[in-house]
């Protein structure tokens, strides 16, 4: 399995962000596919569970991401993306996307460095 992410993402406090993660695999996508999203905070604290997909999507039942994350992927299109809602400044950090698709071997975990900012920079407004 190979993972592709946007690597770096900047988003405005209070808005929603799509954490994009796509993948390729020599094995066909079926019921064995699993996707696990985790979060490493900037302060170096313990990694946190964000989201899990296996046949169906499953939100965390506890913690800071409870009721703030939803599935925005499509396995048939090799898309394992999620939506993170109501961004807060302490959501700054690294989000990891891990895709397992047996019998294919696990690949390198994809990473997205999220920066939550007060306002979007002018250079980014140009592209919006």
């Amino acid at each position: 399995v190979e993972i592709y992410t946007s690597r770096v993402l900047e988003a405005v406090n209070g808005t929603d962000a799509r954490l994009k993660c796509t993948f390729s695999s020599f094995a066909p996508v079926g019921d064995a596919l699993t996707v696990t999203w985790n979060f490493r905070p900037l302060d170096g604290g313990p990694e946190q569970f964000v989201f899990y997909y296996h046949i169906d999507p499953f939100q965390p039942m506890s913690g800071r991401f409870k009721d703030r994350v939803s599935w925005d992927g499509n396995p048939e299109r090799y898309d394992a993306s999620i939506l993170l809602w109501k961004l807060q400044f302490d959501d700054n950090g690294t989000y990891t996307c891990q895709v397992k698709n047996p019998p294919d071997v696990d690949g390198v975990i994809g990473e997205i460095r999220l920066s939550v900012v007060h306002t979007v920079r002018f250079s980014e407004i140009h592209f919006l």
Epitope: T34, G45, P46, F49, M61, G63, R64
Partner: antibody, heavy 116, light 106 residues
Framework: QVQLVQSGAEVKKPGASVKVSCKAS????????MHWVRQAPGQGLEWMGE????????DYNEKFQGRVTMTVDKSTSTAYMELSSLRSEDTAVYYC?????????WGQGTLVTVSS | QIQLTQSPSFLSASVGDRVTITCRAS?????MYWYQQKPGKAPKPLIY???NLASGVPSRFSGSGSGTEYTLTISSLQPEDFATYYC?????????FGQGTKLEIK
């Protein structure tokens, strides 16, 4: 490194209340929800509830609703679990634990004995 | 609430053996956690969300399953693996634990 240090063992009479403390260090206290799990002697694990240290929001196991109160003191990074109307079947080791990717970090446990 | 039933409740095995513990849920759950507990100690996480190894856990431990049936496998038992193992579901509140599987030296 993450550490959760709990208060010492308690012996209580039936009908009394007990308040167990859990002092956290080595991480940002408000970033991780605190859970309480108990284990009766020789028995399995039972989830009691959780508290969001940021705003004090709680979610209790219905079994303990009305008897359990979880609070935090952000200034000292300490969580508290108070259980009232104690009965003999509440004799157990009470653990505080934080949820990261699982219940990854645990206190050393506090033995609460309820005996007349 | 969802009931979790582990089998077997007791298991005798030797160092080097391959061991599998099963956890069955009373209704479908999305994922499973597994913990190891030694006498007088707090539980230690082994597997989170069904198949992911917790930090520092050796690769001889693995988890799998879906729906109502999940398994924890230890590919080659080591002396330090003799302990009690618990499954835990958290795709429905309240989170619940299995009754435990005590793994003893044969």
């Amino acid at each position: 490194q993450v550490q959760l240090v709990q208060s010492g063992a308690e012996v209580k009479k039936p009908g009394a209340s007990v308040k167990v403390s859990c002092k956290a260090s080595g991480y940002t206290f408000t970033n991780y929800w605190m859970h309480w799990v108990r284990q009766a002697p020789g028995q399995g694990l039972e989830w009691m509830g959780e508290i969001n240290p940021t705003n004090g929001g709680t979610d209790y196991n219905e079994k303990f609703q009305g008897r359990v109160t979880m609070t935090v003191d952000k200034s000292t990074s300490t969580a508290y679990m108070e259980l009232s109307s104690l009965r003999s079947e509440d004799t157990a080791v009470y653990y505080c634990t934080i949820y990261t990717t699982a219940l990854d970090y645990w206190g050393q446990g506090t033995l609460v004995t309820v005996s007349s | 609430q969802i009931q979790l039933t582990q089998s077997p409740s007791f298991l005798s095995a030797s160092v080097g053996d391959r061991v599998t513990i099963t956890c069955r849920a009373s209704s479908s759950v999305g994922y499973m956690y597994w913990y190891q507990q030694k006498p007088g100690k707090a539980p230690k996480p082994l597997i989170y969300v069904t198949s992911n190894l917790a930090s520092g856990v050796p690769s001889r431990f693995s988890g799998s399953g879906s729906g109502t049936e999940y398994t924890l496998t230890i590919s080659s038992l080591q002396p330090e693996d003799f302990a009690t193992y618990y499954c835990q579901q958290w795709s429905s509140n309240p989170p619940t634990f299995g009754q435990g599987t005590k793994l003893e030296i044969k």
